[in-house]
């Protein structure tokens, strides 16, 4: 399995972001396909579970991403993307996309470095 991501993503605080992850595999996509998204915070704290897909999508039942993430992928199109809602500044960090599609061997985990930035205010535009 090979993974492709946007590598770097910038999004405005309070908005939603699509974390894009696509993949290729020599094996046909079927019920064995699994997708796991995790998050590594900027402060070096423990990695956190974000999302899981296996036949159906499953949100986390606890933690910071509870009720803030949804599936936006399409396995038949080799798309394992998710939507992250209501971005906060502490969502800054690295999101990892891991796709397993047996019998294909696991590939390198895809990474997206998300930067959540301030909303650009009119005064800032004026001074720019």
């Amino acid at each position: 399995v090979e993974i492709y991501t946007s590598r770097v993503l910038e999004a405005v605080n309070g908005t939603d972001a699509r974390l894009k992850c696509t993949f290729s595999s020599f094996a046909p996509v079927g019920d064995a396909l699994t997708v796991t998204w995790n998050f590594r915070p900027l402060d070096g704290g423990p990695e956190q579970f974000v999302f899981y897909y296996h036949i159906d999508p499953f949100q986390p039942m606890s933690g910071r991403f509870k009720d803030r993430v949804s599936w936006d992928g399409n396995p038949e199109r080799y798309d394992a993307s998710i939507l992250l809602w209501k971005l906060q500044f502490d969502d800054n960090g690295t999101y990892t996309c891991q796709v397993k599609n047996p019998p294909d061997v696991d590939g390198v985990i895809g990474e997206i470095r998300l930067s959540v930035v301030h909303t650009v205010r009119f005064s800032e535009i004026h001074f720019l």
Epitope: T34, T36, N38, P41, D43, G45, P46, E47, Q48, F49, Y52, H54, D56, F58, P60, M61, S62, G63, R64, D90, K100
Partner: antibody
Framework: QVQLVQSGAEVKKPGASVKVSCKAS????????MHWVRQAPGQGLEWIGE????????DYNEKFQGRVTLTVDKSSSTAYMELSSLRSEDTAVYYC?????????WGQGTLVTVSS | DIQLTQSPSFLSASVGDRVTITCRAS?????MYWYQQKPGKAPKPLIY???NLASGVPSRFSGSGSGTEYTLTISSLQPEDFATYYC?????????FGQGTKLEIK
């Protein structure tokens, strides 16, 4: 490194209350929800509830609803679990644990003995 | 609440053996966690969301399954693997644990 240090063992009489503390260090306290799990002697694991340290929001196992209160003190990075109306079947080791990719980090456990 | 039933409850095996523990749910769950616990110690995570190894866990441990049936496999038992193993679901609240499987030295 992540550490969760719990308060010491307690012996209580039936009907009393107990408050167990869990001091967290080695990570940003508000970034991870704190859970409480108990284990009766020689028995399996039972989830009590969870608390979001950022806003104090809680979710309890219905079995304990009305008897358990989870709180946090952000200034000291400490979580608390208070269980009231204790009965003998509440005798157990009580653990605090944080949810990361699983319940990855656990306190050392606090033995609460309920005996008349 | 979703009930998890582990089988077997007790298992005797030897170093080097391949061991499989099964966890059956009373209704379909989306994914499963597995923990190892040694006497007097807190549980230690092995597998998260069905098949992902927790940090620092050796590759001899693996997880699989879907729906109502999940398995934990240890490909070649090591002396330090003798312990009690618990499955846990978190597809619906409250999260629940299996009753445990005690793995003993034959």
């Amino acid at each position: 490194q992540v550490q969760l240090v719990q308060s010491g063992a307690e012996v209580k009489k039936p009907g009393a209350s107990v408050k167990v503390s869990c001091k967290a260090s080695g990570y940003t306290f508000t970034n991870y929800w704190m859970h409480w799990v108990r284990q009766a002697p020689g028995q399996g694991l039972e989830w009590i509830g969870e608390i979001n340290p950022t806003n104090g929001g809680t979710d309890y196992n219905e079995k304990f609803q009305g008897r358990v209160t989870l709180t946090v003190d952000k200034s000291s990075s400490t979580a608390y679990m208070e269980l009231s109306s204790l009965r003998s079947e509440d005798t157990a080791v009580y653990y605090c644990t944080i949810y990361t990719t699983a319940l990855d980090y656990w306190g050392q456990g606090t033995l609460v003995t309920v005996s008349s | 609440d979703i009930q998890l039933t582990q089988s077997p409850s007790f298992l005797s095996a030897s170093v080097g053996d391949r061991v499989t523990i099964t966890c059956r749910a009373s209704s379909s769950v989306g994914y499963m966690y597995w923990y190892q616990q040694k006497p007097g110690k807190a549980p230690k995570p092995l597998i998260y969301v069905t098949s992902n190894l927790a940090s620092g866990v050796p590759s001899r441990f693996s997880g699989s399954g879907s729906g109502t049936e999940y398995t934990l496999t240890i490909s070649s038992l090591q002396p330090e693997d003798f312990a009690t193993y618990y499955c846990q679901q978190w597809s619906s609240n409250p999260p629940t644990f299996g009753q445990g499987t005690k793995l003993e030295i034959k």
